[in-house]
Interface confidence: medium
């Protein structure tokens, strides 16, 4: 019969012959012959291959370097790579999460709109009229000015986006 020029899915052509690819999690040891099947071996402890393949070496699992602020989010298997994420308080600089940067703090006058995650930075918003934030923080939202009226007091000093109002006693009219 004519030697094949193309092979089925999960096969590869070698020496005019179709051999089975190795399944994910295994590497190629030797090609098939007229008389033997493809020989594959499982990847080692810290290795993986995530596709049907004819690789003779497995890939090393990604190392989540703590010196770069990284930690393991999902441990790798023989078929999947390790997934890294950042320590709490940090976020990835790229989708591949190869290093981390510190979550930014929101300055006084700004509050946290959305707390940072492992992949996104803190989102700050200016404190609107009636709200304030007097600290630099990655956690603190804008908070409403104190309501002097509910305490039966009057506003002695107006609030700003960075300071609360100052309440004081009402002036009693003398008879």
């Amino acid at each position: 019969p004519e030697p094949p020029t193309a092979c089925r899915e999960k096969q590869y052509l070698i020496n005019s012959q179709c051999c089975s690819l190795c399944q994910p999690g295994q590497k190629l040891v030797s090609d098939c012959t007229e008389f033997t099947e493809t020989e594959c071996l499982p990847c080692g402890e810290s290795e993986f291959l995530d596709t049907w393949n004819r690789e003779t070496h497995c890939h090393q699992h990604k190392y989540c370097d703590p010196n770069l602020g990284l930690r393991v989010q999902q441990k790798g298997t023989s078929e999947t790579d390790t997934i890294c994420t950042c320590e709490e308080g940090w976020h990835c600089t790229s989708e591949a999460c190869e290093s981390c940067v510190l979550h930014r703090s929101c300055s006084p006058g700004f509050g946290v709109k959305q707390i940072a995650t492992g992949v996104s930075d803190t989102i700050c918003e200016p404190c609107p009229v009636g709200f304030f934030s007097n600290v630099s923080s990655a956690f603190e939202k804008c908070h409403p000015w104190t309501s002097c009226e509910t305490k039966d007091l009057v506003v002695q000093q107006a609030g700003t986006n960075k300071t609360d109002v100052v309440c004081g006693p009402q002036d009693r009219l003398r008879a």
Epitope: N67, L102, H103, N134, S137, F139, E140, H143
Partner: nanobody, 117 residues
């Protein structure tokens, strides 16, 4: 020099409670974000809870939400973690930490919490 000293750990039965304290010095505590993290035996660090400088805004890991409460007393430069309904999986060394503008946070030496019957 930043110093953080945790206390309050110990052995407690499942369902029990503990209150951890963290005495802070060497920095302006009332202006600082603070957090608790923990490390279970043979595991990596796990964030537990964070609190804003004024103590108005608090955040919790899903694993402790509704059971743990973070608080602070800025007049005493002290951070607290009230832990209720403790489970075996809460067994860990608990650290208070001050987020830093460098790669590593400032940490205390930790206090061991063991939940066992």
């Amino acid at each position: 020099e930043v110093q953080l000293l945790e206390s309050g750990g110990g052995l407690v039965q499942p369902g029990g409670s503990l209150r951890l304290s963290c005495a802070a010095s060497g920095f302006t505590f009332p202006e600082s974000d603070m957090k608790w993290v923990r490390q279970a035996p043979g595991k990596g660090l796990e964030w537990v809870s964070s609190i804003s400088p004024n103590g108005w805004d608090t955040y919790y890991a899903d694993s402790v939400k509704g059971r743990f409460t973070i608080s602070r007393d800025n007049s005493k430069n002290t951070l607290y973690l009230q832990m209720n309904s403790l489970r075996a999986e809460d067994t860990a060394v608990y650290y208070c930490a001050k987020p830093a503008q460098v790669l590593f946070d400032y940490w205390g030496q930790g206090t061991l919490v063991t939940v066992s019957s």
